[in-house]
């Protein structure tokens, strides 16, 4: 990989962990004990973003998998997906905008705003075992705050 990256896991503000749900979807649920090993480990890469931006642009890949979170329009709605990439070419210093998230830290919590769709955030539902998605509201029912746990490489 040609860019700095670190391995981490993410939990939402309700302490739900993120796990794979099928080959191209993440879901959020509470895990305990040995089940914690199911949670997805991300490789967070530090990439170039907008010059004037005061947010930290990152790409979120799944560790040792050629899958990245990306934001695309589906049925005219910004949508979060896991996209398969060529591992020989990713991550790279100038990631396509759909792969870039602005990491925003507020009161020790993290938000991940889509660079492609400003004011749309990686979100989880209050309910258990539901897909991780791209949400267009903050401070409502859906959860947009996360904490990051570091995993040694």
């Amino acid at each position: 990989a040609p860019v700095r990256s670190l391995n981490c896991t993410l939990r939402d503000s309700q302490q739900k962990s993120l796990v794979m749900s099928g080959p191209y979807e993440l879901k959020a649920l509470h895990l305990q004990g040995q089940d914690m090993e199911q949670q997805v480990v991300f490789s967070m890469s530090f990439v170039q973003g907008e010059e004037s931006n005061d947010k930290i642009p990152v790409a979120l890949g799944l560790k040792e998998k050629n899958l990245y979170l990306s934001c695309v329009l589906k049925d005219d709605k910004p949508t979060l997906q896991l996209e398969s990439v060529d591992p020989k070419n990713y991550p790279k210093k100038k990631m396509e905008k759909r792969f870039v998230f602005n990491k925003i830290e507020i009161n020790n919590k993290l938000e991940f705003e889509s660079a492609q769709f400003p004011n749309w955030y990686i979100s989880t539902s209050q309910a258990e075992n539901m897909p991780v998605f791209l949400g267009g509201t903050k401070g409502g029912q859906d959860i947009t705050d996360f904490t990051m746990q570091f995993v040694s490489s």
Epitope: P2, L6, F46
Partner: antibody, heavy 127, light 106 residues
Framework: EVQLVESGGGLVKPGRSLRLSCTGS????????LNWFRQAPGMGLEWVGF??????????EYAASVKGRFTISRDDSKSIAYLQMNSLKTEDTAVYYC???????????????????WGQGTTVTVS | SYELTQPPSVSVSPGQTASITCSGD??????ACWYQQKPGQSPVLVIY???KRPSGIPERFSGSNSGNTATLTISGTQAMDEADYYC?????????FGGGTKLTVL
């Protein structure tokens, strides 16, 4: 003034240990990753390892040539980073530098992917 | 492991343009930096993120990076620019340096 100052170098016998310090001033020390480098006499620059800032867990990475022998740590309350060198070899003889690195790209002004402040170096001789 | 290759030496007359190259496999996909080091001194960052110049570095220093080659260009070279120049890139979380180029201003 933003600066880094290395200390702790000296003459040491092969197989022994030495701890170098890198003290920062004039900036928020904990916000930066810190690298250690070395330069053998008349030779080029060689990266030794780095430690991430507190926002990224203070985790470390090392060059293959020192992995298992050298350990980097930091005490942000004192604005000091350390390089603990064990099982020293004659080939570890060099001037050792620390520098700071912005490990993320927040804007065009933060020197992301560049090491903008270097210390003056401290000499380690293993003989 | 990843390697960066620089010419050992480059000579230039005062006022002329000096170009120092750095080659590595798909280097253009990585961020390249350049450091200047004068005898007995610590390195100084002169170019970062391929093309950007830190504050305090003269405009005569510029950088480019594409394909397998990064280039440091010094236009209107001055005697004070005589130094060793090192290219540097990241290979994953490892920092890699070129062997250095001694720039002589004739």
């Amino acid at each position: 003034e933003v600066q880094l100052v290395e200390s702790g170098g000296g003459l040491v016998k092969p197989g022994r240990s030495l701890r170098l310090s890198c003290t920062g001033s004039g900036f928020t020390f904990g916000d930066y990753a810190l690298n250690w480098f070395r330069q053998a006499p008349g030779m080029g620059l060689e990266w030794v390892g780095f430690i991430r800032g507190k926002a990224y867990g203070g985790t470390t990475e090392y060059a293959a040539s020192v992995k298992g022998r050298f350990t980097i740590s930091r005490d942000d309350s004192k604005s000091i980073a350390y390089l603990q060198m064990n099982s020293l070899k004659t080939e570890d003889t060099a001037v050792y530098y620390c520098n700071r690195e912005v490990e993320y790209c927040r804007s065009s002004e933060n020197y992301c992917y560049g090491m903008d402040v270097w210390g003056q170096g401290t000499t380690v001789t293993v003989s | 492991s990843y390697e960066l290759t620089q010419p050992p030496s480059v000579s230039v007359s005062p006022g002329q343009t000096a170009s120092i190259t750095c080659s590595g496999d798909k280097l253009g996909d990585k961020f390249a930096c350049w450091y200047q080091q004068k005898p007995g001194q610590s390195p100084v960052l002169v170019i970062y993120q391929d093309t950007k110049r830190p504050s305090g570095i003269p405009e005569r220093f510029s950088g480019s990076n594409s394909g397998n080659t990064a280039t440091l260009t010094i236009s209107g070279t001055q005697a004070m620019d005589e130094a060793d120049y090192y290219c540097q890139a990241w290979d994953s979380n490892t920092v890699v340096f070129g062997g250095g180029t001694k720039l002589t201003v004739l």
